[in-house]
Interface confidence: low
């Protein structure tokens, strides 16, 4: 009679993570008597996956009933496959012996490859805000995918970016892989509403890529422009001076009025108006009583935006242009919360 052969018909099997892998194995003879065992890997370090004779293998089931006398099908199913299960599996026939069974013949092996989906890409931006015209870096990470082949693209508002560098680790064989990419983005004043998107395409995603996003509103700082103007005289001795703070982001802003270098009032921007591009405008005004002044007054609007060094704009108020009230040597009373007397 011809000597028993162990046949593993599948050279390779590809399974998606979470699914069940079927590893096929048949023997060509019932002789010699003895159990079958399945191993991952070969040589002394091989890992026992299933032993027909004894042991508990909760993830493994046999395709046919191995207790039947004439059974020659030793195929197994391994449930809930993960990338860690990848490897070459060998179906090995043992001959009954005493005290131990003796290895008789091995199949040629079946390579199990596991397809695992990449994790959702996580995009992170710089730790500190940056201003328009500056270049900032964004990183994108995705993990746990297999096989190694993967495509990563960057977009800003739907436009593909080209300035980025991507690494897939590890370089050698592994159960699963990770991708790490860094993209450089030049900020513009219109970027408050902009989004940076990292898109990952992999064979496991069936053409439906995964995306991670970052809002540039978390990254950009648009510094304000200031304009100080003198409004027409509201009353004979009163001048209204306004400070227009335009096109700034984020909203965090503190304004200080200085009169001849002395702090007059400090305000925090509250009731701002929002522009279409997401930036903000704000106006502060100061009502100045000039009747008590013989000299010109230098009014300064000083703005500290988002914790940055203060910027300022000044306006020289010409006192001589306003007629003095007869007999008046004191400034008039404040007539509103934003009015200011000059002494």
């Amino acid at each position: 009679e011809e000597e028993l052969q162990v046949i593993q018909p599948d050279k390779s099997v590809l399974v998606a993570a979470g699914e069940t892998a079927t590893l096929r194995c048949t023997a060509t003879s019932l002789i010699p008597v003895g159990p079958i065992q399945w191993f991952r890997g070969a040589g002394p370090g091989r890992e026992l996956i299933y032993n027909q004779k004894e042991g508990h293998f909760p993830r493994v089931t046999t395709v046919s009933d191995l207790t039947k006398r004439n059974n020659m099908d030793f195929s197994i199913r391994i449930g809930n496959i993960t990338p860690a299960d990848a490897g070459t599996y060998y179906c090995v026939k043992f001959r009954k012996g005493s005290p131990d069974d003796v290895e008789f013949k091995s199949g040629a092996g079946t390579e199990l490859s596991v397809r695992a989906k990449p994790s959702a890409p996580v995009v992170s931006g710089p730790a500190a805000r940056a201003t328009p015209q500056h270049t900032v870096s964004f990183t994108c990470e995705s993990h746990g995918f297999s096989p190694r082949d993967i495509t990563l693209k960057w977009f800003k508002n739907g436009n593909e970016l080209s300035d980025f560098q991507t690494n897939v680790d590890p370089v050698g064989e592994s159960v699963s892989y990770s991708i790490h990419s860094t993209a450089k983005v030049v900020l513009t004043r219109e970027d408050v509403h902009s989004q940076v998107i990292c898109e990952v395409a992999h064979v496991t995603l069936q053409g439906d890529p995964l995306r991670g996003t970052a809002n540039l509103s978390e990254t950009i700082r648009v510094p304000p422009t200031l304009e100080v103007t003198q409004q027409p005289v509201r009353a004979e001795n009163q001048v209204n001076v306004t400070c227009q703070v335009r096109k700034f982001y984020p909203q965090r802003l503190q304004l200080t009025w200085l009169e001849n270098g002395n702090v007059s009032r400090t305000e925090t921007a509250s009731t701002v108006t929002e522009n279409k591009d997401g930036t903000y405008n704000w106006m502060s005004w100061l009502l100045v009583n000039v009747s008590a002044h013989r000299d010109d007054v230098k009014l300064t609007c000083q703005v500290e935006h988002d914790g940055q060094p203060a910027v300022s704009k000044s306006h020289d108020l010409k006192v001589s242009a306003h007629p003095k009230e007869q007999g008046s040597n004191t400034a008039a009373e404040n007539t509103g919360s934003n009015e200011r007397n000059i002494y």
Epitope: H143, S174, S176
Partner: nanobody, 127 residues
Framework: HVQLVESGGGLVQVGDSLRLSCAPS????????MAWFRQAPGKEREFVAA????????SYKDSVKGRFTISRDNARNTFYLQMNSLEPQDTGVYYC????????????????????WGQGTPVTVSS
């Protein structure tokens, strides 16, 4: 079977430093992530830090951020936990853990994600 062997624990003073090591042994081992957990006397085991086998951004327990650093040496197949500015509340048994394949969306803070555990190395910070 994989074994994780920790070393480097001991008795130190407040403000001192220690470096714990974790070396996987046994069959050729590859993991998704390695982590350090700790268990203070009479308390539940808690997550300290984790890092992916292939690198990337580590994850830390809030109270150790800036003081502890988890790192790896691929050539030596060893993971480390550098602990600086130690405080009495850092006292406990420190365990190394390995997550063989990814079971969550990120670096697991949940001990149930980890497949292999070391025996633990005690760290005592005295004031």
């Amino acid at each position: 079977h994989v074994q994780l062997v920790e070393s480097g624990g001991g008795l130190v003073q407040v403000g001192d430093s220690l470096r714990l090591s974790c070396a996987p042994s046994g069959r050729t081992f590859r993991a998704y992530a390695m982590a350090w957990f700790r268990q203070a006397p009479g308390k539940e085991r808690e997550f300290v830090a984790a890092i992916r086998w292939i690198g990337g951004t580590p994850s830390y327990k809030d109270s150790v951020k800036g003081r502890f650093t988890i790192s790896r040496d691929n050539a030596r197949n060893t993971f480390y936990l550098q602990m600086n500015s130690l405080e009495p509340q850092d006292t406990g048994v420190y365990y190394c853990a390995a997550e063989e394949t990814q079971k969550g969306s990120g670096l697991g803070h949940d001990g149930r994600h980890y497949d292999y555990w070391g025996q633990g190395t005690p760290v005592t910070v005295s004031s």
